[in-house]
């Protein structure tokens, strides 16, 4: 029954970390993995969570590197 | 493509320096501009940069006297630096950051001769 | 704060000669590494970035190398037309910084 009652705490700890925390709800992470070959000129854009229009996915990291930040990806397209 | 700055030229100290990049060949919205200016004499010193999106960030010596802004359908970028003295002598450069070159600048403009003196 | 210091400030060099111009950031900046070429009343011009790779046009003679915070920048085979200053400047971050550029070294050729 204990052991039991632990699984079910440690379950529900883990429901509670991988639900809506706020930063899930405004946007992912970009995907840095080609940032540090340098970006392609495709312009593919992406609205970050500061509002702004970032060319590409990868200048959007390429950003946040640059500039110390951590700004999400809001959606796919233009803001 | 191509970068160039306005007419620099004779400044009182106190007075506010606006300098224009006007920009040819691509959009401000997918790249990052960059100025940087050089005392006679002397080494190159970055001023600050806007980026594809917008966002702009300073030297720390000259954050509380500069803005830049932009405006992507005349194709130009602003700095405006206040309280000029003496020591804001020098040619001002823009510079267009290349994000394919990992942020090097790959075209700069000729440059603009700034005085201040009384 | 990633600072540039780049050494010697000056150097002189024959034709045909080896010269080399070392940059050190005070922090590591990955590969993040350009070089620059200015002659007198003249813009800079990009000659190489991140580290190593020669921009467009950029004869052979010149190599860059290094990562991390030790940067070196080698002309073989010096010409007339090398006469000039070179700048190393760091393309890793703008937050904080005072300047993103090295002093500068002037290359004289005899």
């Known amino acids: 029954m204990k052991v039991t009652g632990i699984f079910l705490l440690s379950a529900l700890a883990l429901l509670s970390l991988s639900g809506n925390t706020g930063a899930d709800s405004l946007g992912r992470e970009a995907k840095c993995y080609n940032e540090l070959n340098g970006c392609t000129k495709i312009y593919d854009p992406v609205c970050g969570t500061d509002g702004n229009t970032y060319p590409n996915e990868c200048v959007l990291c390429f950003e946040n590197r640059k500039r110390q930040t951590s700004i999400l990806i809001q959606k796919s397209g233009p803001c | 493509q191509s970068v160039k700055e306005s007419e620099g030229g004779l400044f009182k100290p106190t007075d506010t320096l606006t300098l224009t990049c006007t920009v040819s060949g691509f959009s401000l919205s997918s790249y990052a501009i960059s100025w940087v200016r050089q005392a006679p004499g002397n080494g190159l010193e970055w001023i600050g940069r806007i980026n594809s999106g917008g966002a702009t960030d300073y030297a720390s010596w000259a954050r509380s006297r500069s803005t830049i802004t932009r405006d992507t359908n005349l194709n130009t970028v602003t700095l405006q630096m206040t309280s000029l003295t003496a020591a804001d002598t020098a040619t001002y450069f823009c510079?267009?950051?290349?994000?394919?070159?990992?942020?090097?600048?790959?075209?700069w403009g000729p440059g603009t001769l700034v005085t201040v003196s009384s | 704060a990633y600072d540039m210091t780049q050494t010697p400030a000056s150097v002189s060099a024959a034709v045909g000669g080896t010269v080399t111009i070392k940059c050190q950031a005070s922090e590591s900046i990955s590969t993040y590494l350009s070089w620059l070429q200015q002659k007198p009343g003249q813009p800079p011009k990009l000659l190489i970035y991140?580290?190593?790779t020669l921009a467009s046009g950029v004869p052979s003679r010149f190599k860059g190398s290094g990562s991390g915070t030790e940067f070196t920048l080698t002309i073989s085979g010096v010409q007339c037309d090398d006469a000039a200053t070179y700048y190393c400047q760091q393309d890793y971050t703008i937050s904080n910084v005072g300047n993103v550029f090295g002093g500068g070294t002037e290359v004289v050729v005899k």
């Open positions: 991140k580290a190593s």
């Open positions: 510079a267009k950051e290349e994000y394919s070159y990992g942020g090097a600048y790959g075209m």
